[in-house]
């Protein structure tokens, strides 16, 4: 029961996390204009991974996509890649974990197969979460670097008494959504891996078999001991647990391959 709960909870947490990663990736507020030096601006700038937006005094918001691919900073491309890899892995993980759920019966799927699928999806969620956290962190680092660089040469156009304040950007809502979502996906993945262990305890050195000590087949005779142990052909004997534990080199690894959009 605890295993089912852990698996189910892991699935739900991962589902929320991946939904969050998708939301963060699509959001326009990855970086927002820092209002510290210009709190009365009537023009508010904010940027996402795919487009930049400007909200004007009228309340009208205009967004323009980054229609170039080669002209974009390599770091932005890397963040895009990390987020997309995270989404793809997470989506595959969700698909796999649906079939792995103990509460869902699909044909005559054995528990060992479910355990393997649970572990696979768990690892995928962990990698997905790490991709999202890495992507958001790289972007945040880029923002911090640019923030202090623009602070260093804050007033760039000192033309007489007129000053041109360079627009500085700070953390947008999408970064926090991304960090939380990545963390949730990671936690969900760990829970799936824990559930997998519950589904299939590690195999010991000896084969796990059931011992049948049937009364009629054991004979006690004076002067000797004869026992029919039923050890013969074990084809009819069922294992108590279907072993789902796999050695580390058996676990499938999924390459982080990604075509840039």
């Amino acid at each position: 029961m605890a295993v089912t709960a852990c698996q189910g909870l892991g699935f739900v947490v991962s589902l929320i996390g991946i939904a969050g990663i998708i939301a963060a990736t699509c959001m326009d507020q990855w970086s927002t204009q820092d209002l510290y030096n210009n709190p009365v601006t009537a023009v508010f700038n904010y940027q996402g991974l795919w487009r930049s937006c400007v909200r004007e005094s009228s309340g009208f918001t205009e967004c323009r996509g980054y229609f170039t691919l080669l002209g974009l900073p390599a770091m932005l491309q890397a963040v895009r890649a990390l987020m997309i890899v995270g989404i793809v892995l997470g989506a595959i993980g969700l698909l796999v974990s649906i079939f792995a759920l103990k509460c869902i019966r699909i044909g005559s799927m054995e528990d060992s197969a479910k355990a393997n699928m649970t572990l696979t999806s768990g690892i995928m969620f962990i990698v997905s979460g790490l991709c999202a956290i890495a992507g958001v962190s790289v972007f945040a680092n880029m923002l911090v670097t640019n923030f202090w660089m623009s602070t260093a040469n804050m007033y760039t156009g000192m033309g007489g008494m007129v000053q041109t304040v360079q627009t500085r950007y700070t953390f947008g809502a999408a970064l926090f959504v991304g960090w939380v979502a990545g963390g949730l996906t990671l936690i969900g993945g760990v829970m799936m891996c824990i559930a997998c262990r519950g589904l299939a305890p590690e195999e010991t050195n000896y084969k796990a078999v059931s011992y049948h000590a049937s009364g009629h087949s054991v004979a006690y005779k004076p002067g000797g001991f004869k026992a029919s142990t039923g050890f013969g052909s074990n084809t009819k004997n069922k294992k108590i647990y279907d072993g789902g534990a796999r050695t580390e080199d058996e676990v499938q690894s999924y390459p982080s391959k990604h075509d840039y959009v």
Epitope: N38, T41, N45, S52, S58, Q163
Partner: antibody
Amino acid sequence: QVQLVQSGAEVKKPGASVKVSCKASGFTFTSYNIHWVRQAPGQGLEWIGYISPGNGGSNYNLKFKDRATMTSDTSISTAYMELSRLRSDDTAVYFCATGRGFAYWGQGTLVTVSS
Amino acid sequence: DIVMTQSPDSLAVSLGERATINCKSSQSLFNSGNQKNYLIWYQQKPGQPPKLLIYRASTRDSGVPDRFSGSGSGTDFTLTISSLQAEDVAVYYCQNDYSYPLTFGGGTKLEIK
């Protein structure tokens, strides 16, 4: 088409308050900010502030911060601007404006403050 | 606050001639986020509300005749009427649309010579 229809002219005594309304039609009322601008007789334009009907947020010119109150009623697509503690130099035509670059203006409401 | 200074205060131009009105702001109205200048030009005739001519320094509003054009960047802006018509007689205002409080120029009264 976009229209902003303002309430009629008002005559007030110094120290009193006036509430001017601006009824919008022809666009999604909550999508754009409603700005208020005034123009004293024979003078230039002066920005009072704006209200954002979508979220109720507002921004005031510090000159009017303690006397002006902007509200809106989204159910009837109407914005209001109330100016309290009126003085004789508040005599002006009060306009509401909206749209990109203030593309749409109300016809104006003349507020006369006289004892 | 950003101070908007218009020049000249009044201008008399012959019909069919070019009219030029200048506007200077005390701070830059250039937004680096989208590389646009947030300056607006209005035309106001007696007893009427102002009418939008140009926004973002150079973008003509729909329905505005193409004889009206806006130019400039940063702190210096110009409204040009390429060929003055009788119906262009009015007061013209520039407005800072970049920083609160939004501020207007003092106005330029355009007349026919």
